[in-house]
Amino acid sequence: KKEDGESTAPTPRPKVLRCKCHHHCPEDSVNNICSTDGYCFTMIEEDDSGLPVVTSGCLGLEGSDFQCRDTPIPHQRRSIECCTERNECNKDLHPTLPPLKNRDFVDGPIHHR
């Protein structure tokens, strides 16, 4: 979900934005801080064993509108929140995993012995 207003084409920020990064720190980050022309994000998703994993970092302006839209992906429990209102704003983002749907149990991969 986008935290500060929807727009079709993201307008370039006049200045760099610093974000907290965790599990998603690019090479040019320093002390778990990355910089971007786009958005800060925090994401929660299930790993292969069904445990929730929280990731945070920077999204470049290019394509970030789509990534921040949080379109549901079949068979994948994941939620992302984005922000731009201040540096390290993603420290205060707390996305939650979408609830399990009954279909998620039925439609899972079938393992044959």
């Epitope: 006049p14 200045k15 990355c34």
Partner: antibody
Framework: QVQLQQPGADLVKPGTSVKLSCKAS????????MQWVKQRPGQGLEWIGE????????MYNQKFKGKATLTVDTSSSTAYMQLSSLTSEDSAVYYC?????????WGQGTTLTVSS | DVVMTQTPLSLPVSLGDQASISCRSS???????????LHWYLQKAGQSPKLLIY???NRFSGVPDRFSGSGSGTDFTLKISRVEAEDLGVYFC?????????FGSGTKLEIK
């Protein structure tokens, strides 16, 4: 037009502190970072750090942590850099500079002389 | 810290000549966003630096088209096609990809 006004010079004693100022005009002060850069003769330019006036978020060059403290007064569109425990090594020209993704405008610089 | 190595340190030219300054960085300046934050400044005697070129090859407003920038990754060049008297001074390259931001040691453009 964008202007960054700095006092021309300051003379201070070793062991003391000094607060350098940089008054911005001609643009929205909170829309850009303000950086500070040190220049000593024959030693090139050194990045001290930067402050985002919109939320007072700072980033420092590790080398200047504990030496420099960056602040802003948004009501007067002025950025400040305090330098503490001054020695002759701190004698230099100090520039403030407007930064978005690169520095596009510089102040005229303040020549700081540390001498007893 | 990223080390910016500029060559030559001094560049004697005749007015009307072409001048070329090289800047090499100790690591790639391609940012995770895809941008390359390498910039060029000119500092004339007794003045503050002035921006010439930003993000490798973009001329800043009011900068004559005889100035051009090129390069990628770790290797960058500033060219002045026909040197004029007002171009004399010290040229610095600078990177704002990696914190702390760093500068080249400068190239002094002077009359032969």
């Amino acid at each position: 037009q964008v202007q960054l006004q700095q006092p021309g010079a300051d003379l201070v004693k070793p062991g003391t502190s000094v607060k350098l100022s940089c008054k911005a005009s001609g643009y929205t002060f909170t829309s850009y970072w303000m950086q500070w850069v040190k220049q000593r003769p024959g030693q090139g330019l050194e990045w001290i750090g930067e402050i985002d006036p919109s939320d007072t978020y700072t980033m420092y060059n590790q080398k200047f942590k504990g030496k420099a403290t960056l602040t802003v007064d948004t009501s007067s569109s002025t950025a400040y850099m305090q330098l503490s425990s001054l020695t002759s090594e701190d004698s230099a020209v100090y520039y403030c500079a407007r930064f978005g993704y690169y520095v596009d405008y510089w102040g005229q610089g303040t020549t700081l002389t540390v001498s007893s | 810290d990223v080390v910016m190595t500029q060559t030559p340190l001094s560049l004697p030219v005749s007015l009307g000549d072409q001048a070329s300054i090289s800047c090499r960085s100790s690591q790639s300046l391609v940012h995770s966003t895809g941008n390359t934050y390498l910039h060029w400044y000119l500092q004339k005697a007794g003045q503050s630096p002035k921006l010439l070129i930003y993000k490798v090859s973009n001329r800043f407003s009011g900068v004559p088209d005889r100035f051009s920038g090129s390069g990628s990754g770790t290797d960058f060049t500033l060219k002045i096609s026909r040197v004029e008297a007002e171009d004399l001074g010290v040229y610095f390259c600078s990177q704002s990809t990696h914190v702390p931001f760093t500068f080249g040691s400068g190239t002094k453009l002077e009359i032969k």
